[in-house]
C-alpha cells in the first residue's frame, strides 16, 4: 500500500512539476525591467525565451518574437535546449509512469516490468528536473552578470549633457516557477525510484544457508532483487542500475497598430 501511495504521489508531483516546466518555458516573464532606483518609466519591459514584450502605461502590450536563431546569444539557446530536453524527458517519463502505476492493470504485465518502468520514469523525472533547474539557473546567472554590468554604466552621458536611460533587468516570475517546477519534478522522480524498490516481485528471502561440498565450502546468500532499466525480461539478482544515456538534442518583426497581444 505504501509503495502504491509513494508511486502515485511521485507521479502526481512529477506531473505538476512538468506542467510547471512547460508553463515556465512558455512564459514571457523570464526577465523583467528592474524598477528599483530607476527613473519611473511609462513602459515596462519584460523578456522570455521566445519573445520580448513591452507593456505601456496605456495598457497596451506589444510582443515581438525572436525570429532569428543565429543572432541570439548562445546562453539563451542553451537555456532553450535545456528546457526543451527537460520537457521531452518529462513527457516520456509521464507516459512510461502511467503504464507503470500499480493501480493500473494492463494485460498480464508482470510486477518486474512495472518496477523497470517505474525506475525508468523516475530517472527521467530526475534528469528532467535537473535540466529545468540548470536552464533556469543559467538564465539567472546571465541576468545577474548583465545587471551589474548595466549598473556600472546605468546612465551613459552623451557629451556630458544628455542622459540615456539604461534598462536593467531582474528575475522574472518564470524563473521562480521554473525552479519550483524543476524541484517538484526531481522530488517526484526520487519518489518513483523509491517506489521501484518495493514493486519488485515478492521473493522468499531464505536465511543464509551453508552448503558443504566435498573439498571446499561455499556460503551462498540469495540477494535481494534489483531491477534493471530495460523493458525486456529481467535477469535475476542483477545489481546494476543502468541510468541510460542522456542526449541534449535538441525573426524580429515590427507589428502594426493592430498587432497587439
Amino acid at each position: 500500500m505504501a509503495v502504491t501511495a509513494c508511486q502515485g504521489l511521485g507521479f502526481v508531483v512529477s506531473l505538476i512539476g512538468i506542467a510547471g516546466i512547460i508553463a515556465a518555458t512558455c512564459m514571457d516573464q523570464w526577465s523583467t525591467q528592474d524598477l528599483y532606483n530607476n527613473p519611473v518609466t511609462a513602459v515596462f519591459n519584460y523578456q522570455g525565451l521566445w519573445r520580448s514584450c513591452v507593456r505601456e502605461s496605456s495598457g497596451f502590450t506589444e510582443c515581438r518574437g525572436y525570429f532569428t536563431l543565429l543572432g541570439l546569444p548562445a546562453m539563451l539557446q542553451a537555456v532553450r535546449a535545456l528546457m526543451i530536453v527537460g520537457i521531452v524527458l518529462g513527457a516520456i517519463g509521464l507516459l512510461v509512469s502511467i503504464f507503470a502505476l500499480k493501480c493500473i492493470r494492463i494485460g498480464s504485465m508482470e510486477d518486474s516490468a512495472k518496477a523497470n518502468m517505474t525506475l525508468t520514469s523516475g530517472i527521467m523525472f530526475i534528469v528532467s528536473g535537473l535540466c529545468a533547474i540548470a536552464g533556469v539557473s543559467v538564465f539567472a546567472n546571465m541576468l545577474v552578470t548583465n545587471f551589474w554590468m548595466s549598473t556600472a554604466n546605468m546612465y551613459t552621458g552623451m557629451g556630458g549633457m544628455v542622459q540615456t536611460v539604461q534598462t536593467r533587468y531582474t528575475f522574472g516570475a518564470a524563473l521562480f516557477v521554473g525552479w519550483v517546477a524543476g524541484g517538484l519534478t526531481l522530488i517526484g522522480g526520487v519518489m518513483m525510484c523509491i517506489a521501484c524498490r518495493g514493486l519488485a516481485p515478492e521473493e522468499t528471502n531464505y536465511k543464509a544457508v551453508s552448503y558443504h561440498a566435498s573439498g571446499h565450502s561455499v556460503a551462498y546468500k540469495p540477494g535481494g532483487f534489483k531491477a534493471s532499466t530495460g523493458f525486456g525480461s529481467n535477469t535475476k539478482n542483477k545489481k546494476i542500475y543502468d541510468g541510460g544515456a542522456r542526449t541534449e538534442d535538441e525573426v524580429q518583426s515590427y507589428p502594426s497598430k493592430h498587432d497587439y497581444v
Epitope: 518609466t41 511609462a42 520580448s52 496605456s58
Partner: antibody
Framework: QVQLQESGPGLVKPSETLSLTCTVS????????ISWVRQPPGKGLEWIGE???????NYNSSLKSRVTISKDNSKSQVSLKLSSVQAADTARYYC???????????WGQGTLVTVSS | DIVMTQSPDSLTVSLGERATINCKSS????????????LTWYQQKPGQPPKLLIY???TRESGVPDRFTGSGSGTDFTLTISSLQAEDVAVYYC?????????FGPGTKLEIK
C-alpha cells in the same frame, strides 16, 4: 463613437478642493487608461496624472501632494480632485484617453475652472 | 523631470511651403525594449482640445494627412509639414511619453505668411 466629457464647477474659492468628473462613452474604462491635462489661459499644456485600467495611478510630482484621481468603471466616470487650490490652478482641465505610445488619442472639450474668491 | 524644448517659438510659412518644428528632450526617449521613441506630437487649434498627430515619434495617427511626418530618435525630434495648408494654422506640442512626469514642450505657433 468615442466621447469624453468633463464636468464640474467653473468657479472654486482659494484653499478649497476642485472636483471634476470625466464621463466617457464608446469604450470601457477597464480597457483604456485615462489621463488629465490642464492648460492655463494662453499658456501650454501640463500633465496632471493618469489612472490605469487596473485602477493604479501616477501623478505629476509637482501636484502629487494635492491631487487624487479615481474612477468608477460601472458609471464610466473618472474623477479628479485637487485640494488647496490657488489662483495658479486656474486653467482649462482636459481628460484624455491613453492609446498607443501612451499618447492621448481622444480628448474631452475641457472645462474651464477659475480659482477666485 | 524631463525638460522638453521646442524651436522655434513661432513659425511663419507660406501656403504650400514646408514647415519644420524641432523638439529636444533632456533625456533619451528611446525604449530599449522595443526600440521605439516615446514622443508624441499634438496640434491645437484655438478654442479646441489638442489633436493627436504622431505617436512613437514617427507613427501617424489614423486620419492624419500624410503631409505630417515625424522623425528623430533619442533626444532630437522633428515634425515636418511638407506642404502647408490653411487649416494647419495651430500650436504644435511635443510630449515625452516615456519617463514620468509626462512633460509637454512649450509649443510652437505656426502661422501663414
Amino acid at each position: 463613437q468615442v466621447q469624453l466629457q468633463e464636468s464640474g464647477p467653473g468657479l472654486v474659492k482659494p484653499s478649497e478642493t476642485l472636483s471634476l468628473t470625466c464621463t466617457v462613452s464608446g469604450f470601457s474604462l477597464t480597457s483604456y487608461a485615462i489621463s488629465w491635462v490642464r492648460q492655463p489661459p494662453g499658456k501650454g499644456l501640463e500633465w496632471i496624472g493618469e489612472i490605469w485600467t487596473g485602477g493604479g495611478t501616477n501623478y505629476n510630482s509637482s501636484l502629487k501632494s494635492r491631487v487624487t484621481i479615481s474612477k468608477d468603471n460601472s458609471k464610466s466616470q473618472v474623477s479628479l480632485k485637487l485640494s488647496s487650490v490657488q489662483a495658479a490652478d486656474t486653467a482649462r482641465y482636459y481628460c484624455g484617453r491613453l492609446s498607443y505610445g501612451n499618447s492621448l488619442d481622444y480628448w474631452g472639450q475641457g472645462t474651464l475652472v477659475t480659482v477666485s474668491s | 523631470d524631463i525638460v522638453m524644448t521646442q524651436s522655434p517659438d513661432s513659425l511663419t510659412v507660406s501656403l504650400g511651403e514646408r514647415a519644420t518644428i524641432n523638439c529636444k528632450s533632456s533625456q533619451s526617449l528611446l525604449n530599449s525594449g522595443n526600440q521605439k521613441n516615446y514622443l508624441t506630437w499634438y496640434q491645437q487649434k484655438p478654442g479646441q482640445p489638442p489633436k493627436l498627430l504622431i505617436y512613437w515619434a514617427s507613427t501617424r495617427e489614423s486620419g492624419v494627412p500624410d503631409r505630417f511626418t515625424g522623425s528623430g530618435s533619442g533626444t532630437d525630434f522633428t515634425l515636418t509639414i511638407s506642404s502647408l495648408q490653411a487649416e494647419d494654422v495651430a500650436v504644435y506640442y511635443c510630449q515625452n511619453n516615456f519617463i514620468y512626469p509626462l512633460t509637454f514642450g512649450p509649443g510652437t505657433k505656426l502661422e501663414i505668411k
